[in-house]
Interface confidence: medium
């Protein structure tokens, strides 16, 4: 129904706390360089204005759209052009073009320092002094670094952060309590960020139809007892919600997400037997719980898929007269039978089925032509199964760090033109797939591995799009979203690449490496490894092992030395010489 004042409507639906959090996220995602203090001032102004509209929906400007109100606020910021350059040009446009312009200027890799977690005592002091401000800073810092983070989910992580701090700051050993718990929240949030970025990429590049297909497959896997009409309704709602969040309509997105959770909980009987535990929780936890819900049990009496989609004589009629509904039904039926497949694989199979019908229904004897289609799925299913098998075996053999290094070598050889920091980030994330997925039961491995890899590769594509340097990467990133992972997997050593000059300074290290945390130390070593591969793209595994082993010993030795600086200064050049020789 239409509301006189959109902002009043959202304020009443969401409540002040969530309203303020979402407005802060929206501003932080649009203007990523502004300090917290500047954003919080705007948030307060918007909140005060919303309250006047709640009191009187006919008050001045209350009838304006939220995009108009937010855009006007952002465009009134002094020195906007000084800080944001051409983003200020957006302010000359009218809505909806102005908002589109803001969206285009979102930076997936903003030039911001990594988010440093304060020391435990300091963190607890500032949290206890002002929890609202502390959590506001958290929202701001995460949102500006991840401009497509799913806003209602970020509110959930802030709530989790709050819970951890409330619990741990009363403990005697605060750090021991905080570190593992906050690490777990951070890990989940980072995965959520790349997953959501993938959803927004899907929406931006391929539109709502492609996203809805993804949603149908996912929902059918989770809720195999729900009917197609129910799955379609859920997929339509989820598509709308994600479109809103990806488009910067965060208040509407969060409000609609809460509505969907309410609907699901009121209709458990027709959706899934597993929802009850989620439905007893408060709104943010309820939505999150539903989003992570385990699969319902597959109905025992499902007939063979062939009866409906291969053996039936009406296949071509259905395809011709109701393409989307027929293909949607196929995707639903196949997905509900295969929770052990990745969504990407299910979409590839649906695409193969569509291409087969497209070809066969134009021929003289369609049933004879499409009769073998299910058998033709086999190679498409085997490819990702083999990928999981070989990569999990490698992970089990090498451990996470070693596996990351193997992936780094592989991807540097595939796309040596890509910047080293981007390659290292991608390889570290791709390498985490082992820890995340390879320890799961067999039936859960494939969906975990492939859908996670797809999200990480989407991040690589998004960064590469900003400064395209590799034709091969551009080719894989330009194609369909579901073909990306197989495309990257199929890439081999780039034969067109002219090896990088050997620069001694790239492999020169100082004593500051000794005091770095383990993660930073690993990144330094992995940076060196990527540079080595760029220098010698065809170096053998043994050569790289020798050089990296030598390097690790050198760092270890010098960090234990009494005069560290002197050790690095004298041993460093020897290491460089030995490395050059080993790679010759």
């Amino acid at each position: 129904e239409a509301h006189k004042s959109e902002i009043a409507h959202r304020f009443k639906d969401l409540g002040e706390q969530h309203f303020k959090g979402l407005v802060l996220i929206a501003f932080s995602q649009y203007l990523q360089k502004c300090p917290y203090e500047e954003h919080i001032k705007l948030v307060q102004e918007v909140t005060d204005f919303a309250k006047t509209c709640v009191a009187d929906e006919n008050a001045e400007n209350c009838d304006k759209s939220i995009h108009t109100l937010f855009g006007d606020k952002l465009c009134a910021i002094p020195k906007l052009r000084d800080n944001y350059g051409e983003l200020a040009d957006c302010c000359a446009k009218q809505e909806p073009e102005r908002n589109e312009c803001f969206l285009q200027h979102k930076d997936d890799n903003p030039n911001l320092p990594p988010f440093q977690r304060p020391e435990a005592e300091a963190m607890c002091t500032s949290f206890q002094e002002n929890p609202t401000s502390f959590l506001g800073h958290y929202l701001h810092e995460v949102a500006r670094r991840h401009p497509y983070f799913y806003a209602p989910e970020l509110l959930y992580y802030a709530e989790k952060y709050n819970e951890v701090l409330t619990q741990c700051c009363t403990e005697s050993d605060k750090a021991a309590c905080l570190t593992p718990k906050l690490d777990a929240v951070k890990e989940k949030a980072l995965v959520a960020a790349v997953r959501q970025r993938m959803k927004c990429s899907s929406m931006q590049r391929f539109g709502e139809r492609a996203f809805k297909a993804w949603a149908v497959a996912r929902m059918s896997q989770r809720f195999p007892n729900a009917e197609f009409a129910e799955i379609t309704k859920l997929a339509t709602d989820v598509t709308k919600i994600n479109k809103e969040c990806c488009h910067g309509d965060l208040l509407e997105c969060a409000d609609d997400r809460a509505e969907l959770a309410k609907y699901m909980c009121e209709n458990q009987a027709t959706i899934s037997s597993k929802l009850q535990a989620c439905c007893d929780k408060p709104v943010l936890q309820k939505s999150q719980c539903l989003a992570e819900i385990e699969h319902d049990n597959i109905p025992a009496d499902l007939p063979s898929i062939a009866a409906d989609f291969v053996e039936d004589k009406e296949v071509c009629k259905n395809y011709a007269e109701a393409k989307d509904v027929f293909l949607g039904t196929f995707l639903y039926e196949y997905s509900r039978r295969h929770p052990d497949y990745s969504v990407s694989l299910l979409l590839r199979l649906a695409k193969k089925y569509e291409a087969t019908l497209e070809k066969c229904c134009a021929e003289g004897d369609p049933p004879a032509c499409y009769g073998t289609v299910l058998a033709e799925f086999q190679p498409l299913v085997e490819e990702p199964k083999n990928l999981v098998k070989t990569n999990c075996e490698l992970y089990e053999k090498l451990g996470e760090y070693g596996f990351q290094n193997a992936v780094l070598v592989r991807y540097t050889q595939k796309a040596p033109q890509v910047s080293t920091p981007t390659l290292v980030e991608a390889a570290r994330n791709l390498g985490r797939v082992g820890t995340k997925c390879c320890t799961l039961p067999e039936a859960q491995r494939l969906p975990c591995v492939e859908d996670y890899l797809s999200a990480i590769l989407n991040r690589l594509c998004v960064l590469h799009e900003k400064t395209p340097v590799s034709e091969k990467v551009t080719k894989c990133c330009s194609g369909s979203l579901v073909e990306r992972r197989p495309c990257f997997s199929a890439l081999t050593v780039d034969e067109t690449y002219v090896p990088k000059e050997f620069k001694a300074e790239t492999f020169t290290f100082h004593s500051d490496i000794c005091t770095l945390p383990d993660k930073e130390k690993q990144i330094k070593k992995q940076t060196a490894l990527a540079e080595l591969v760029k220098h010698k793209p065809k170096a053998t595994e043994d050569q790289l092992k020798t050089v990296m082993g030598d390097f690790a010993q050198f760092v270890d030795k010098c960090c234990k030395a009494a005069d560290k600086d002197n050790c690095f200064a004298t041993e460093g050049p020897n290491l460089v010489a030995r490395s050059k020789e080993a790679l010759a």
């Epitope: 197609f228 009409a229 009866a307 259905n318 109701a322 509904v325």
Partner: nanobody, 126 residues
Framework: EVQLLESGGGLVQPGGSLRLSCAAS????????VAWFRQAPGKGREFVAG????????YYADSVKGRFTISRDNSKNTLYLQMNSLRPEDTAVYYC???????????????????WGQGTLVTVSS
């Protein structure tokens, strides 16, 4: 739970007409594929006609094409089968069946339809 109730059967002369009705309760008839099947004495249940749910696509067995018309009235939650130019070989018990969650008639195999009415007898004889 879905309930289906057929009516409109009877005795009719060859060349005559009849209109069968199938009233549904427990679900909206426009949401799902619904079909008419028939069963002659000593034979299996065979597909006669069907209509898609949410998409008005109609399906007919070759033996009834051009003579029978399937339709539905969503406001009454009722499915119809208009039968013209009836022949003695059309004599059978006519059933309506539904496959919940199916927007299209993707099968004419009776075993795949979990919900049935009790049937209405149509006799074509002079």
């Amino acid at each position: 739970e879905v309930q289906l109730l057929e009516s409109g059967g009877g005795l009719v002369q060859p060349g005559g007409s009849l209109r069968l009705s199938c009233a549904a309760s427990g679900r909206y008839i426009d949401e799902t594929a619904v079909a008419w099947f028939r069963q002659a004495p000593g034979k299996g249940r065979e597909f006669v006609a069907g209509i898609g749910g949410g998409v008005d696509i109609t399906y007919y067995a070759d033996s009834v094409k051009g003579r029978f018309t399937i339709s539905r009235d969503n406001s009454k939650n009722t499915l119809y089968l208009q039968m013209n130019s009836l022949r003695p070989e059309d004599t059978a018990v006519y059933y309506c069946g539904t496959r919940p969650g199916r927007p299209l008639i993707t099968s004419k195999v009776a075993d795949l339809y979990p919900y049935w009415g009790q049937g209405t007898l149509v006799t074509v004889s002079s």
